[in-house]
């Protein structure tokens, strides 16, 4: 007995399509072996028509395909534009046609029902709207118009121009009679039901002069579309329900074990908490279509999803729907990356974002998920360098480490930064991922002055203190701009033994600007990294001003009278603890003096540290 299974009998009508699904045990060998669909001839041989290796016979060209779904041990043969010649005996199988792993399928294609001459065929999905057109002659213009449904040998009145409506069609049918000169009336049926399927008769007038037109209404069940996406990746459900419901509330729901449908998200503001931070309902187009994006896919997201329209924002019988069956592939191409990243107030986070490594040239983006109404995700930063204004000086997107991962650094954290953020590109949408930033109790590890005022033409020295745990990390200073953070040249960093015992006094990396110019004004970051993996950062704003009085050292009142929560550092620069500086102008009155001494030799901007630079693992 063959382990392959499928439908023994498939029947359809000319012009239709069939989708034949064959099941096989999903062993490793079976998953990767050739799949085929062949037709049995009189000789007993089975001639291949289509296979998983790309072969399509001339008879099937342009109208058939075979798709293998190895994750769940199935393959599907789609055949369109059926003709009666397609009737016959077939096999779906694995391996070689003449061997045992196959299943016999009988396909019967019939002519379709005999319809009265001139019958118009309307094919519409359940829940949608149909408009039946009924022509008539001038002499019948003033006479009664009606639509009947033929049931067996009898005709049942559905609607007429005398305001009769059959109870089965109540509140979802209307008969429209146009103005003079137009010799056609229409019957519009909304929210079609399967029971509406059948043959209808339009009639205008009575007696032997009456006008008649037959209409065959075929109401189709929406067959769920199979969607296969990777664990941790993203799925987009595109939902087009038609203009008739363009102004009706929309929803996406998931079918539960009781076969009712739980709302996942709707346009009335409802959202399932299981999808918090990782779902967006994109605004609908003029035609009423919309899409729902879910990121950070989990195995438990698998299931059947329906999108629909109804004023209550949830599933109701007879209203249009679209269906999907979502499968989440655990053998994911999307690498694991932290879904939660923690930082302290005043500190920083470095977020690793995966992207499709085949799309290294794609634009990279980072956005903040906002849950209000249908959800939105305004972009905060992109790889071309645009940064939202309120994130100036504290947000940067780096292409490193590359090869399928980019890095986003956010510093000067406040509790308001807690939330969900999305990593995305302008390429493969399935690689959208979500990360949650949580702000926890604690102190930043890197300590820099709150903000600094440098004097034009003089030397500025900014210290950055770091704890022993970063002694083996690479330390750097960089100047922030909206296109990134340009690393500043580093001086000779002294003996590598300096940190063997992690000397309290030597845990310092300093930035020297000599001489200070106008172009030096801006944000500077002190940071640690290991290879291409970035760790913590701290930011300081440097304001540049003219010399006050030649030869004198100006000390601001704020410096002379330091507040209790401020530590005065030995470089003559104040550190304001736990302040997340968003806008340097708020601190304009706090001026701190720069060193006046000229630095002999070396680069104009330099980083000074006595740290040993051991390349270690990741600081993720």
């Amino acid at each position: 007995k063959s382990p392959v299974f499928g439908p023994q009998e498939v029947s359809s009508v000319e012009g239709n399509s069939v989708s034949i699904k064959c099941y096989y045990p999903p062993t490793s060998v079976n998953r990767h072996t050739r799949k085929y669909w062949c037709r049995k001839g009189a000789s007993g041989r089975c001639i291949t028509l289509v296979s998983s290796e790309g072969y399509v016979s001339s008879n099937y060209a342009g109208r058939a395909n075979l798709t293998n779904f190895p994750e769940n041990g199935t393959f599907v043969v789609n055949i369109a534009q059926l003709s009666r010649d397609d009737s016959g005996h077939y096999k779906c199988g694995l391996g070689i046609n003449s061997r045992g792993l196959s299943f016999d399928v009988s396909l019967e294609v019939s002519q379709g029902p005999e319809l009265p001459n001139g019958t118009e065929v309307y094919t519409v999905d359940v829940g949608r709207t149909v408009t039946i057109k009924c022509p008539f002659k001038t002499e019948n213009a003033p006479k009664t118009k009606a639509l009947y449904k033929k049931i067996g040998q009898t005709s049942v009145l559905v609607i007429d121009s005398r305001n009769y409506v059959n109870p089965n069609y109540k509140d979802r049918i209307r008969l429209r009679i146009p103005g003079t000169g137009q010799l056609i009336f229409t019957v519009v049926i909304d929210r079609l039901r399967l029971s509406d399927h059948g043959l209808y008769l339009c009639q205008a007038g009575d007696g032997s002069n009456r006008d008649e037109k037959n209409a065959d209404l075929q109401v189709l069940e929406p067959e769920p579309e199979l969607v296969y996406e990777d664990l941790r990746g993203s799925v987009t459900f595109h939902c087009a329900l038609g203009l008739e419901v363009a102004n009706v509330a929309k929803f996406l729901c998931r079918v539960n074990s009781r076969e009712t449908c739980d709302v996942v998200i709707n346009t009335l503001g409802k959202r399932d908490s299981a999808f918090e931070g990782r779902i967006l309902l994109n605004p609908q187009d003029k035609d009423g279509s919309f899409s729902v994006v879910i990121t950070g896919l989990r195995k438990e997201d698998e299931g059947r999803y329906l999108c629909g329209a109804h004023s209550d924002g949830q599933l109701q019988e007879g209203w249009p729907i679209q269906a999907w069956q979502l499968f989440v592939n655990e053998e994911s191409t999307i690498p694991r990356s932290p879904t939660v990243v923690k930082g302290v107030a005043g500190g920083s986070v470095a977020v690793l974002c995966p992207y499709n490594p085949k799309e290294s040239q794609s634009l990279k983006y980072w956005c903040l998920w906002e849950g209000a109404q249908n959800g939105r995700c305004p972009l905060l930063v992109e790889s071309q360098g645009l940064v939202q204004e309120q994130y100036e000086g504290r947000l940067s997107l780096l292409q490193e480490p590359g090869n399928g991962t980019f890095t986003v650094i956010l510093n000067q954290l406040t509790t308001q930064d807690a939330g969900f953020y999305w990593c995305l590109t302008n390429g493969d949408t399935r690689w959208r991922t979500t990360v949650e930033i949580k702000i926890i109790e604690g102190e930043p590890n890197l300590k820099v002055p709150g903000n600094v005022t440098a004097v034009l033409g003089e030397t500025l020295n900014i210290p950055c203190h770091f704890p022993c745990k970063f002694s083996s990390y690479e330390k750097y200073w960089c100047k922030w701009s909206n296109t990134g953070c340009q690393t500043l040249p580093s001086q000779d960093e002294g003996p590598s033994e300096a940190f063997v015992n992690c000397d309290e006094n030597s845990r310092l990396v300093s930035l020297t600007l000599n001489p200070v110019t106008r172009a030096d004004e801006g944000w500077y970051w002190c940071g640690v990294k290991q290879g291409h993996f970035y760790g913590e950062t701290a930011a300081v704003y440097v304001a540049v001003e003219e010399k006050k009085v030649a030869g004198s050292r100006y000390v601001s009142p704020a410096k002379a009278d330091a507040a209790p929560d401020e530590k005065v550092l030995d470089s003559g620069v104040r550190e304001i603890e736990n302040k997340a500086i968003q806008d340097p102008r708020l601190f304009a009155e706090e001026k701190v003096v720069a060193d006046t001494g000229d630095q002999a030799g070396g680069s104009r901007a330099s980083v000074d540290s006595s740290s040993s630079e051991e390349q270690g693992g990741s600081s993720k």
Partner: nanobody, 126 residues
């Protein structure tokens, strides 16, 4: 909720025929596959036959033991599915259950069906 009501079971002689009916009512959204399972005393419930449809296309699935003896069909207008059982054998004795689903992942799998009837007894004497 979908309600399924089976009928047509009974006591017959080996070699005789029976026709089971399953009427569906009260749907919340489209059902597009209905089938029959059976459970003999002391055994697990097993797949017998399923019919799936999409517009005017139908797909019929049968268990190996059926071997051309059983035929599944449906009447769209009546929302009813039938199982015509010919050449019945004593080993066909079981309670026959009707099942329906809105999505058919695998016709043979019990968990692919969301709705179930109460069952109808078929007894075949030798």
């Amino acid at each position: 909720e979908v309600q399924l009501v089976e009928s047509g079971g009974g006591l017959v002689q080996a070699g005789d025929s029976l026709r089971l009916s399953c009427a569906a009512s009260g749907r919340t959204f489209p059902t597009y596959a209905m089938g029959w399972f059976r459970q003999a005393p002391g055994k697990e419930r097993e797949f017998v036959a399923t019919i799936r449809w999409s517009g005017s296309t139908q797909y019929k699935y049968y268990a190996d033991f059926v071997k051309g003896r059983f035929t599944i069909s449906r009447d769209n207008a009546k929302n009813t599915v039938y199982l015509q059982m010919d050449s019945l054998k004593p080993e066909d004795t079981a309670v026959y259950y009707c099942a329906a689903t809105t999505l058919l992942t695998d016709p043979r799998a019990l968990n692919a069906y969301a709705y179930w009837g109460q069952g109808t007894q078929v007894t075949v004497s030798s």
